[in-house]
């Protein structure tokens, strides 16, 4: 990997081995400055292959509020309006950090922690296998 | 929003207020204990709206990688194979948090940060506005 | 007000080129995803071309690839469509349209809905 001089103005840490505790500054940094914040908003009605958003709160994690997006249909959407099985709605996952309160309802004091969201659908066509 | 009882065994943190500094345990917990590590691997060519995967790549945050999706057409795959350019892919973005080493190259010392990832695409029926 | 104002349409011979022009006013353009739509008689519309707010990522329909190229000068808020061997397929009118949202690709348009009619006909 890229190896990078460390900053001499960095703050002391007592513990140099994984597991390692670090300083985080829960002030967020935005980079979307760029971004309407309706964004894809929409799309779980236009799309091919729509979806439902339930909400997924959990007042020891951070963030809190997790939107988890689940497909309406098994099949797609197709030119006529209808719902076509002859292809199928799939959620698209993707695995994202969270902070994780650690010990358990301590205000500022965490461990990471991976979790896997559905973020939309996309229509796939169907692979089947045949096992016997 | 919920109050939760602090937990006596709690680290001290000297202060208490926004832009508050947290005490985080890079030891990742993964919950994703149940899932298939291929997961939506192969959507990206299966789908009617198929995407691409670009790394992107930054030592001065963590994670370091992250994939992002580039839909590979305006239009979406038809029935017969071909791009249907009256119909759109569009990526489906989703905000995550990540961490930024700060000060710069700095081992131990982060603050998060939100940024936009392209997760995938999908296929939806586009909206026209007359402006004129 | 958004304003999208298309230009350089006209009766070109097969094999022939025009190059379209779209002036456009009252929004960044510099932040906006920009598009080239066509409209063949008695058709749909059709996304033939998308242009990235900085210019580096392009879409072309296949019918249209290596014969069209989108460009832009967002110092003069201004979108291209160079149009090379053309065919009588092309004839249609053709509108240039904005992403109704900043930043990147929705499926989500505004254009000016005036157009410029190319037709291709020996």
């Known amino acids: 990997g890229i190896t990078i001089p460390r900053n001499p103005g960095c703050p002391n840490s007592e513990d140099k081995n994984f597991p390692r505790t670090v300083m985080v500054n829960l002030n967020i940094h935005n980079r979307n400055t760029n971004t309407n914040p309706k964004r894809s908003s929409d799309y779980y009605n236009r799309s091919t292959s729509p979806w439902n958003l339930h909400r997924n709160e959990d007042p020891e994690r951070y963030p809190s509020v997790i939107w988890e997006a689940k497909c309406r249909h098994l099949g797609c959407i197709n030119a006529d309006g209808n719902v076509d099985y002859h292809m199928n709605s799939v959620p698209i996952q993707q695995e994202i950090l969270v902070l994780r309160r650690e010990p358990p309802h301590c205000p500022n004091s965490f461990r990471l922690e991976k979790i896997l969201v559905s973020v939309g659908c996309t229509c796939v066509t169907p692979i089947v296998h045949h096992v016997a | 929003g919920i109050t939760i009882p602090r937990n006596p065994g709690c680290p001290n943190s000297e202060d208490k207020n926004f832009p508050r500094t947290v005490m985080v345990n890079l030891n990742i917990h993964n919950r994703n204990t149940n899932t298939n590590p291929k997961r939506s691997s192969d959507y990206y060519n299966r789908s009617t709206s198929p995407w691409n995967l670009h790394r992107n790549e930054d030592p001065e945050r963590y994670p370091s990688v992250i994939w992002e999706a580039k839909c590979r057409h305006l239009g979406c795959i038809n029935a017969d194979g071909n791009v249907d350019y009256h119909m759109n892919s569009v990526p489906i973005q989703q905000e995550i948090l990540v961490l930024r080493r700060e000060p710069p190259h700095c081992p131990n010392s982060f603050r998060l940060e939100k940024i936009l990832v392209s997760v995938g695409c999908t296929c939806v029926t586009p909206i026209v506005h007359h402006v004129a | 007000e958004v304003q999208l104002v298309e230009s350089g349409g006209g009766l070109v011979q097969p094999g022939g080129s025009l190059r379209l022009s779209c002036a456009a006013s009252?929004?960044?353009?510099?932040?906006?995803?920009m598009y080239w739509v066509r409209q063949a008689p008695g058709k749909g519309l059709e996304w033939i071309s998308a242009l990235a707010p900085g210019g580096g990522n392009a879409y072309y329909a296949d019918s249209v690839n290596g014969r069209f190229t989108i460009s832009r000068d967002n110092a003069e808020n201004l979108l291209y469509l160079q149009m090379n061997s053309l065919k009588s397929e092309d004839t249609a009118v053709y509108y240039c349209?904005?992403?109704?949202?900043?930043?990147?690709?929705?499926?989500?348009?505004?254009?000016g809905g005036q157009g410029t009619q190319v037709t291709v006909s020996s």
């Open positions: 009252g929004f960044t353009f510099s932040s906006y995803w």
């Open positions: 349209a904005k992403d109704h949202n900043v930043g990147y690709r929705t499926g989500e348009y505004d254009y």
